[in-house]
Every structure is written in C-alpha cells, then in structure tokens.
C-alpha cells in the first residue's frame, strides 16, 4: 500500500506566448498520492470547469485555451491539493502575441494651406507595432513639419500644397505588417492673384485687354468690377491650366475707369477672395483738344439708334450744357418734323440728320468728329428730298422758322468736305449707298440747282448717277 504523499509540482508553469485565435496550453505536472484535485486561476480568479473556452484534461494537469483572445493575457496558476500537506501552486504568464491591427485608420482630409493636419492611425499588436507612413509610393520622411506621433497619427504643421496626395499608415511588429487603406490629403489654397491687371494709359477708342491670373484650390472663379459695378461691356475669355485661372477682359475704351479683378474660391461653407485693381486712363490730350468744342463717347440715345452704327463713337458738342441730352432733344424735334415728308425722303433725311448731329469720331492725333461727305449731303438735298428741301428753304427765307426751328440740324452741303478730295475726311451714309443700288427710277426732281450739280456717288451703275462726274471743290 502506497503511502500518502503531498502534491509536488514537477513541471512548473512557464510563460506561454500565443497568437490570437490560436491554442495556448499550460501544463501542470503533479506527483502525489492520493491523486490531487487541481484547479486553475487566471489573475487569481477561478476558471470554471464548464467554461467552454477552456479545456482541462489529464486530470486537470493540462489547461488549454481553445482560441486565444487578446483579453486572455494574464497570470495563470494551477493549484494542487490532495489533503496531505498543504496545497501547492505554480504560476506562469500568458502573453498574447498579436499581429498589428489598425483600429482607427486614417480618413480623407481637406485642409487649408498653412493649417495643421492630423491623420489618425491607432494600432493594436503585441509586441507593440511601430507605425510609419507612406505617401504615394514612397516612405514618408519626418522633418520639422512632419511627425509621427506616439499614437501613430501623422501630424503635419503648416500644410503646404506639396503635402497633398495619397497616404497610408503601416503598422509593423515581429509578427507581421498591417496597411491602412489609401486616404487622400487635399490641400485647399486660398484664392491668390498671381498676375494683377496692369494699368493702361491709352488712346481714346482703343481696345485694351486686362489680364488677371489667379491660383487656388479649388480653382478660383474670377469676376471683374468696373468702377464698383459689374462690368457691363467688354468680352471675357478664361482658361484654366494647372489650377491657375487666366481671365482676360477686353474693353473698348471711351472713358477712364477703375477695373478690379476678384478671385474667389470656396472652402467648406466659407469663401476666400483676392482682389487686384488697375486703372485705365485716356492718354492726356493736348490743350488744344480740351479747347475744341466737345468730346467723343458712345451714342446712348434712342432716336438715332437704328441709324448709327452699333457702338458708334460720336461727337458731343460741349457748347451745350448737357450735350448728350441737348443733341438728343434736337434730333427728336427734327424727327417730328420729318413725319410729314415723303417715304423716299424720310429715311435719307434721318440718315443725314443723325450723322450730322452725331458725327462719327475718328482716331488720329486725337479723336475728332468727321463731317458727312458733301456728295451724300447733296444726294439727300437734291435727289431724295429735293421738294422738301426747297420747301424748307422757302419757309426759312420767309422767316417761318423763328420759333426755334432754325435750330434744325440740317447741314450746309457746300461747307462739307468732298470724298473726292480726301476720302478719309468725311463720313459716308451707308443707307444711301444701299438705296442707290436698289433705286431704278426716281420721281421727277424739282431741284434748286441745275441738274449738273446733282452728285455722282462712287461706283454708281444705276440711274442714281443722273449726272456726269460731279466736279466739286
């Protein structure tokens, strides 16, 4: 018969390393008589025999954790007791080894240039993973602006445009490597003007192109302001290349102005703007020009709108207090007088009066008004409106126009230059050029002059040229 023997643990527990989801086994070999009762604790808490996560075999001498979890690490002890002597205990640690795992991966970030960006990368693993970052295809190097924090997060101070790109974090330990998904760092840049429009001192009536170039992320939009208001005339051409927007405003200069280029882009709910301004001044005219009796500007009236060329620059006489209104009133009065004239005469007279009262400005040393060519004046007077002109002259001689009608803007043809002497000295009336090509017969003309004085307009092939070459000086 065996003698009773107190339990002796012949194989003390050792530290066990186990990977998550793998099997970990502690062995507690006991010699004793009678056979001992063996119990197991984890962190001094009794492991229940019916806990399905464990398997206890070999009379309790073998503890197996069937699928290790990271929460299983701790101190495991086996306690053997058979009633003979005291209970004996042996303890060992379970170190749960874990391949790196990224528990809080980075996310896409939009950040304004100059601010601080933090891309998170929280990891788990045993041994503790080291965290590094990849930008594009290359390992990211830390520097005075860029650092990987203890937590694994990437911090970028004073973010620059070149920091934009695709990033991923890498967690690494002796057991393996984990990669995050690629995330995008977008660096938004406040709108900034790279090239401000230049001021110009130009001749009157010239075209000027103001150019404004801006950069930003997102690409800015450019708008133009003229003297505080949205630009009302001119054409704008835009192009975008490499996040740079180039806007060109082409203007027809008839007055000085302050032109402002405004570049705007949006960051979330907020906008950023940048402005640059340029002045367009009209080249200083000589003193004699200031002494001359008026100025050139675009016609903005209504009466002659259909007669004068679109956007025509015309002369306004400063001997009137308000030239534009005064001349418009004059032409309005004349228009009413013309209601009574014949259908042949009226459009010709309208063309004559409008072009006489609102003379076309032409460039040169300074812009100055161009009178109507004598030939066209005589065509109206002696062909289209012969009867009406005679009647008006008759009334004038009898003093019937004393009530202001002598102000009717009717030119004196003899005081107008001839296009045969200087074809660039006077304005032609396109209406008459058109009509003479389309009129084949004229009503009988009662002329105030002999027929030899009726003008011969250029390139005439129709019966409009009712005389030989009209000799004029």
């Amino acid at each position: 018969e065996k003698l009773p023997k107190a339990p002796v643990i012949t194989t003390p527990l050792e530290t066990v390393d186990a990977l998550v989801e793998e099997v970990a086994t502690f062995m507690c070999a006991v010699e004793s008589y009678p056979q001992p009762e063996i119990s197991w604790t984890r962190n001094k808490i009794l492991i229940k025999l019916f806990d399905t996560r464990y398997s206890i075999r070999e009379n309790g001498q073998l503890l197996t954790i069937l699928s290790v979890e990271d929460s299983d690490d701790g101190i495991y002890c086996c306690i053997a007791n058979n009633g003979v002597g005291g209970a004996v205990e042996s303890c060992g640690a379970l170190q749960v080894k874990m391949k790196p795992k990224i528990t809080r991966p980075p996310i896409n970030v939009k950040i304004i240039e100059g601010l601080k960006a933090v891309l998170p990368c929280t990891t788990m693993g045993n041994p503790k993973p080291s965290v590094s970052w990849i930008k594009g295809d290359n390992a990211l190097r830390e520097n005075s602006r860029i650092a990987v924090l203890e937590s694994g997060s990437l911090r970028i101070h004073n973010v620059q445009k070149e920091d934009a790109g695709q990033y991923r974090c890498v967690a690494k330990n002796s057991l393996g490597t984990a990669y995050s998904k690629l995330v995008k760092l977008e660096v938004e840049v406040f709108a900034r003007i790279l090239r401000a429009p230049e001021s110009h001192n130009v001749t009157f009536g010239s075209f000027v192109t103001l150019r404004c170039t801006a950069i930003g992320i997102p690409v800015p939009t450019i708008s133009w302001i003229e003297n505080g208001n949205a630009v009302s005339s001119g054409s704008i051409q835009e192009s975008v290349k490499d996040r740079v927007i180039d806007s060109r405003l082409q203007l027809f200069i008839t007055k000085p102005g302050l032109y402002t280029c405004i570049a705007t882009n949006k960051h979330g709910e907020k906008f950023s703007t940048a402005k640059a301004a340029a002045t367009v001044s009209i080249a200083e005219w000589s003193k004699s020009q200031k002494d001359s009796q008026g100025y050139c500007a675009q016609y903005r009236g209504e009466v002659c709108d259909a007669v004068l060329a679109k956007d025509a620059l015309v002369f306004f006489n400063t001997s009137y207090r308000d030239p534009e209104d005064a001349q418009e009133l004059l032409i309005h009065t004349a228009w009413n007088e013309l209601k009574a004239v014949s259908p042949l005469c009226r459009p010709a007279a309208e063309a004559l009066l409008c072009n006489h009262l609102f003379q076309e400005c032409s460039p040169g040393v300074v812009p100055t008004p161009m009178p109507i060519c004598r030939e066209y004046c005589l065509a109206v007077k002696e062909l289209f409106c012969a009867k009406e002109w005679q009647a008006m002259e008759g009334k004038a001689h009898r003093g019937l126009y004393r009530s202001g009608m002598h102000l009717l803007p009717v030119p004196e043809c003899s005081k107008l230059p001839s296009m045969h002497r200087d074809p660039t000295a006077c304005t032609r009336l396109p209406y008459l050029d058109y009509k003479k090509e389309n009129i084949t017969t004229f009503p009988s003309i009662t002329s105030s002059r002999p027929s030899a004085d009726i003008p011969n307009l250029p390139a005439s092939t129709s019966s409009f040229a009712v005389s030989p070459a009209y000799s004029m000086t």
Epitope: S288, V365, K415, D422, A425
Partner: antibody, heavy 115, light 112 residues
Amino acid sequence: EVQLVESGGGLVQPGGSLSLSCVASGFTFSLYYMNWVRQAPGKGLEWLSVIDTHSIAYYADSVKGRFTISRDNVKNTLYLQLNNLKPEDTALYYCVLGRTALVRWGQGTQVTVSS
Amino acid sequence: DIVMTQSPSSVTASVGEKVTINCKSSQSVVFGSNQKSYLNWYQQRPGQSPRLLIYYASTQESGIPDRFSGSGSTTDFTLTISSVQPEDAAVYYCQQAYSAPTFGSGTRLEIK
C-alpha cells in the same frame, strides 16, 4: 485739280528760323485737314504736324515747342514756322492734304541747317 | 508712339511677278468703334513726292491701278502688287493713322 506748292526753304544756320508756306488750289482749302511731313536726305518719311478745320494744331513730339503750324483760309495758305533749327532738321518739307490718309502731296521745299 | 516695322527692306522682282510687302504695328490700329484699320500705303518713285495707294488697309485710292491691293488687320498688314510693272520701281511706305502718324522705314522695290 488739287495743287500744293511749297516755298520758303533754304539754307539756315543752327539756332536760326525759317517760315515755310504752302499755297493750295483746286479745292475748298478751309474744309480739309492739312499736314507737314518731312524727309531727310536718303531717309524715310516723318510726320510733323497737322492743323484741323478749326485751326487746332497737333505736333509730333520731335518738333513740339519749336515748330508752329497755321493756316489762312482766305489766302488758301498753310504755314510752318521753324524756330531753333538743328542740323537734324535738314530735310525736304512736304505740305500734304489729308485727315486719316495723306492724300495729296506737294513737291516739297528743301531746308538745310548748316553752319 | 506706335512703331511700324516694314519687311523686307528691299526686294527685286521681274516684270509680271507678284510682290508682297509686309508691315507690322507695335499695337493694334483697328478702331473699335467702326472696326476700320487705320493703315495706309504710299509709293515714292525716285525724285518724286509720295502718293497714296491704299487707305483703311484695303481701300484703293482713286486712280491707282488694280494690281495694287492691301490686306490685313489688327497689327499685320500686306501690300501686294499682283503683276509688277517697270513703273512700280519705288520705295513703298506703310503709315498708321490710329494715333499721331508714324511711318514704316520703307521697302525699296527694284525691277530686274
């Protein structure tokens, strides 16, 4: 037929003065812009001055303050007063009718500035 | 001032040949109001005064033979003589009238 006849040219010392005239015929003189253009020997053309129908004058920068253009519509005559002449003013001086284009040219009068 | 650059400075051609003379302005000479090009061409035969050939870049002055034509716009202009004649031997000048008038340096045409 338009005719422009210049006169008044000659030899003058540097710093001296000269008055050129241009008599016009064949057109209503008062209704047209008139110009002076010069041509240095073997060189190109240089516009000097224009006078409009209101007798308002304009000048090239090179002669501003030294030359004066004027007109007498009664005498149908255009003038150019040349003061403080320099050797580089030596040229054939043309009287020209025209506003935007220089349409009719005289035969010119020679001005020689030399000591 | 607007600078006018003419090319070539001289050209030699046979009777019947086509000749083109170019003129470039340092800025546009098109007047926005009427879209006319304020560019003129002149001929100066040896020992003679200049005479106007073309005005407004392409309008032929009266009395000028049809073989002379002008074209171009903005800053680039051309005078074309479609079939050179012996009497065309001369110096040709372009001139802008957009601002204070300025001339090109001239192109001498010699006939072989």
